[in-house]
């Protein structure tokens, strides 16, 4: 009779995670007599997976009913294979005896595990950036097997070329991490604008994961003021119109000064948006100019969500006849943007909401 | 280590049942088959049956068909053994005995268990 | 049903002496390669013992001077030289069907 040999077919075997993985094993002889074992890796420090003779082993089952007579099949099946399950496993066979004793190992079989990489995560800045600013974004994805995966980043479709990716760890290990941080330049039509992060790997067949974050986040779009005078609405009363335009977000307070003291504040409620995501608020001072004896200096002063004040004025001289202030020219503008942004006229605007 | 602990002697009338048992330790129990093998006073060894606790499968000698019944209890991984209308030669020592190999022999043995039939 | 005749029935050997105990089957327990016969030892208000397996393969912890051998119908279970802790009566057992056992040879020293 030719001497046992253990057979194990497969050098390797690469399983998804979650599914069971089948580890074949077969030997070539009834002699001699003992049980069959299973081990992850080798060594001292290898592992018990399964024991024919005893234990508790509640993954495993045996592929073929091993009690019957000449069974020689001591395949195993594994369920609910994790990343941590990857190793090489051998298919021990061993002697009967006071105790069992190890006489003959298969060549082992290489069990790899597919993970799916987890949803990408995007994170944008802490604090809101400016238009023309560039912002840095992190991606992050954890537990993927194997090793190799592709990202890429796109801003609305757009690929971009400005980034850093890293995959831990960089040794052998169970499963692995992909870090990535890209840099983005805000424009002032980012509010709508969307920065993906695209994820492809082995086991999603050719459906990569997205992680976005909405610029709507990040960007911070400063207001442009202008001040204007309106068409006498009463006698002795000036109409003074502030245009808060093309800001994001909403969150605006606007103060009416009157030669340097505060008239009136309100909060950006009812606002116009623009195509682009961007808000426009008009806000208007009636003034009683039989109140003032001297030139008024109007001031309109807006806080855009939390950031220091602009502001821009309008001399209102109340020397000429009220009836000459209805147009723009009996009273000299000189109000000027704190700001340096430039006024222009916003063909974008869908409707406007005026508030008394 | 493998040991098969067996219950005490029974002293039994003819017609009367036994029902031996045979609790199993140091190994997996429902992975072996169990055997069951008697040896009246002086005589020979005789083969029962066999049961595999896995799935309750069993091979009985003909001469036993219809009078033994082996079960297991896998909760307590013990083996019974059954002998039902009982007559005087079936005095004997009975045996568990444990198939290592699964080659339908016996490897390990309990230290049996003297069932008596008189009257 | 196959049947186990075993020869002789008892047989006295000398110390130091090779005994050797036959085991004829009522047909072959040949099958799948291997011969389905096995050899036990049993003494005295004990259980028996495995000695031999598949014929010729000595169980665990079987002192080298027990040996088994045949093929078939025709078996024999050989002590090189016998002890005196040897003296048992000896059993074989086939299992190329269900399990049958010879009916047993009583080993003593002359």
């Known amino acids: 009779e030719e001497e046992l040999q253990v057979i194990q077919p497969d050098k390797s075997v690469s399983v998804a995670a979650g599914e069971s993985a089948i580890l074949h094993c077969t030997v070539t002889s009834l002699i001699p007599v003992g049980p069959i074992q299973w081990f992850r890796g080798a060594g001292p420090a290898r592992e018990l997976i399964y024991n024919q003779k005893e234990g508790h082993f509640p993954r495993v089952t045996t592929v073929s009913e091993s009690t019957k007579r000449e069974n020689m099949d001591f395949s195993i099946s594994i369920s609910n294979i994790t990343p941590a399950d990857a190793g090489t496993y051998y298919c021990v066979k061993f002697r009967k005896g006071s105790p069992d004793t190890e006489f003959k190992s298969g060549a082992g079989t290489e069990l790899s595990v597919r993970a799916k990489p987890s949803a990408p995560v995007v994170s944008g800045p802490a604090a809101r950036a400016t238009p023309q600013h560039t912002v840095s974004f992190t991606c992050e994805s954890h537990g993927f097997s194997p090793r190799d995966i592709t990202l890429k980043w796109f801003k609305n479709g757009n690929e971009l070329s400005d980034f850093q990716t890293n995959v831990d760890p960089v040794g052998e290990s169970v499963s692995y991490s992909i870090h990535s941080t890209a840099k983005v330049v805000l424009t002032r039509e980012d509010v709508h604008s969307q920065v993906i992060c695209e994820v492809a790997h082995v086991t999603l067949q050719g459906d990569p994961l997205r992680g976005t974050a909405n610029l709507s986040e990040t960007i911070r779009v400063p207001p442009t003021l202008e001040v204007t005078q309106q068409p006498v609405r009463a006698e002795n009363q000036v109409n003074v119109t502030c245009q808060v335009r093309k800001f994001y977000p909403q969150r605006l307070q606007l103060t009416w000064l009157e030669n340097g003291n505060v008239s009136r504040t309100e909060t950006a409620s009812t606002v116009t948006e623009n195509k682009d995501g961007t808000y426009n608020w008009m806000s208007w001072l009636l003034v009683n100019v039989s109140a003032h004896r001297d030139d008024v200096k109007l001031t309109c002063q807006v806080e855009h969500d939390g950031q220091p004040a602009v502001s821009k004025s309008h001399d209102l001289k109340v020397s000429a006849h009220p009836k000459e202030q209805g147009s723009n020219t009996a009273a000299e503008n000189t109000g000027s943007n704190e700001r340096g942004s430039s006024d222009y006229k916003d063909d974008d605007d869908k409707h406007h909401h005026h508030h008394h | 280590q493998v040991q098969l602990v067996q219950s005490g002697a029974e002293v039994k009338k003819p017609g009367a049942s036994v029902k031996v048992s045979c609790k199993a330790s140091?190994?997996?129990?429902?992975?072996?088959?169990i055997n069951w093998v008697r040896q009246a006073p002086g005589q020979g060894l005789e083969w029962i049956a066999m049961i595999d606790p896995s799935d309750s499968e069993t091979h009985y000698n003909q001469i036993f068909k219809d009078r033994a019944t082996l079960t297991t209890d896998t909760s307590t991984s013990t083996a019974y053994m059954e002998l039902r209308s009982l007559r005087s030669d079936d005095t004997a020592v009975y045996y568990c005995?444990?198939?290592?190999?699964?080659?339908?022999?016996?490897?390990?043995w309990g230290r049996g268990t003297l069932v008596t039939v008189s009257s | 049903d196959i049947v186990l005749t075993q020869s002789p029935d008892s047989l006295a050997v000398s110390l130091g002496e090779r005994a050797t105990i036959n085991c004829r089957a009522s047909q072959s327990v040949r099958s799948s390669g291997y011969n389905w016969i096995f050899w036990y030892q049993q003494k005295p208000g004990q259980p028996p013992k495995l000695l031999i397996y598949l014929a010729s393969n000595r169980d665990s912890g079987v002192p080298d001077r027990f040996s088994g051998s045949g093929s078939g119908t025709d078996f024999t279970l050989t002590i090189s030289s016998l002890q005196a802790e040897d003296v048992a009566v000896y059993y074989c057992q086939h299992s190329r069907e269900l399990p049958t056992f010879g009916q047993g040879t009583k080993l003593e020293i002359k």
């Open positions: 140091g190994y997996t129990f429902t992975n072996y088959w």
């Open positions: 005995a444990m198939d290592y190999g699964s080659l339908y022999a016996m490897d390990y």
